[in-house]
């Protein structure tokens, strides 16, 4: 009777347990009753990090110098390339897929002064009644929404990182 589950590092194909391809390689053909799984090493500039049955390896990340990036760790057939910002440049966000010469103000902080050709961004903490939920080199702290002006009530208080949440007034009074 054909198996319904396979062991670790195997997968079920046409009622057979086939071996997965090891990290650094990709699938070229599934196993048969007569032949094992056929795998092929990833090409240069590509990688696969896990045991897999994928027909394509993944492309290494490109650390584009014109996005302010440089290679921190070169990719291998089993690992992706890791990028970091050029000296003096700053990640535009947590993902750090691009960099800017001027720093961003983190959530909870707003821009007090936008960067100029000679000075970096100046950030300030959002005071009570204001918030910033984004990392930005341009945005000031925004005032909390005024629920009253919308005939609503505060359902959830605001913080320096979040706006208040308004909701309908309780009719049962």
């Amino acid at each position: 009777e054909p198996p319904t589950a396979c062991s670790d590092k195997q997968y079920l194909h046409d009622g057979q347990c086939c071996d997965l391809c090891q990290p650094g390689s990709r699938l070229t053909s599934h196993c048969t009753a007569l032949e094992k799984t056929q795998c092929h090493p990833c090409d240069s500039g590509e990688f696969s990090a896990q045991w897999n049955r994928e027909i394509r390896c993944h492309q290494h990340k490109y650390c584009d110098p014109n996005l302010g990036l440089r290679v921190q760790q070169k990719g291998t057939s089993e690992t992706d390339t890791i990028c970091t910002c050029e000296e003096g440049w700053h990640c535009t966000s947590e993902a750090c897929e691009s960099c800017v010469l001027h720093r961003s103000c983190s959530p909870g902080f707003g821009v007090k002064q936008i960067a100029t050709g000679v000075s970096d961004t100046i950030c300030e903490p959002c005071p009570v009644g204001f918030f910033s939920n984004v990392s930005s080199a341009f945005e000031k702290c925004h005032p909390w929404t005024s629920c009253e002006t919308k005939d609503l009530v505060v359902q959830q208080a605001g913080t320096n990182k979040t706006d208040v949440v308004c909701g309908p007034q309780d009719r049962l009074r």
């Epitope: 492309q59 110098p65 302010g68 691009s98 010469l101 080199a137």
Partner: antibody, heavy 117, light 106 residues
Framework: EVQLQQSGPELVKPGASMKISCKAS????????MNWVKQSHGKNLEWIGL????????TYNQKFKGKATLTVDKSSSTAYMELLSLTSEDSAVYYC??????????WGQGTSVTVSS | QIVLTQSPAIMSSSPGEKVTMTCSAS?????IHWYQQKSGTSPKRWIY???KLASGVPARFSGSGSGTSYSLTINSVEAEDAATYYC?????????FGGGTKLEIK
């Protein structure tokens, strides 16, 4: 307020070249990346290339190499894209878009280019 | 190049409904960014780094995903959400966009 103001619509003849400008206001363009994007028939967006406004370094989509040339004038906070040897295939709306938070944060209003004899 | 395939190409929804659109990458990407474009206007950054809402984007929007599969969800759709939404990747040159999902509101 951060804004990107692009030059006006253009009607150009096949074989001609033209230059679109994108002026930043509300911030200094230097140290941010400026992207250029093509939109044909109000449909798909195609990334043309980008310029590092600090170094002047450019990265192009291979498809647009030889078609587009990107430059920047830091003193006027203006980025430019020159389109060469225009054909009807180049008729589209072209956008500049500044990168500041990972994505393309700020977009110009678009410049419509019509190539016709 | 990394091809981003968005589905559906067009979708129709009624106000209050939950809507999900997807963006599938031909090769693994670490993050996806989403843009909203209304007819006759420039695209706007909508969601960046897969799940972070841009400033001014209503909380009914959310983004998620990893690897080759990403999605944008609107919890309770409103008339003002009618637009075309594009996904985009910064992983490898060329930095491609998806073909877009046009959201129509009944």
């Amino acid at each position: 307020e951060v804004q990107l103001q692009q030059s006006g619509p253009e009607l150009v003849k096949p074989g001609a070249s033209m230059k679109i400008s994108c002026k930043a206001s509300g911030y200094s363009i230097t140290g941010y990346t400026m992207n250029w994007v093509k939109q044909s028939h109000g449909k798909n967006l195609e990334w043309i290339g980008l310029i590092n406004t600090y170094t002047g370094g450019t990265t192009y989509n291979q498809k647009f190499k030889g078609k587009a040339t990107l430059t920047v004038d830091k003193s006027s906070s203006t980025a430019y894209m020159e389109l060469l040897s225009l054909t009807s295939e180049d008729s589209a709306v072209y956008y500049c878009a500044g990168t500041g938070t990972g994505a393309m944060d700020y977009w110009g209003q678009g410049t419509s280019v019509t190539v016709s004899s | 190049q990394i091809v981003l395939t968005q589905s559906p190409a067009i979708m129709s929804s009624s106000p209050g409904e939950k809507v999900t659109m997807t963006c599938s990458a031909s090769s693994s990407v670490s993050y996806i960014h989403w843009y909203q474009q209304k007819s006759g206007t420039s695209p706007k950054r909508w969601i960046y780094d897969t799940s972070k809402l841009a400033s001014g984007v209503p909380a009914r929007f959310s983004g998620s995903g990893s690897g080759t599969s990403y999605s944008l969800t609107i919890n309770s759709v409103e008339a003002e959400d009618a637009a075309t939404y594009y996904c985009q990747q910064w992983r490898t040159n060329p930095y491609t966009f998806g073909g877009g999902t046009k959201l129509e509101i009944k």
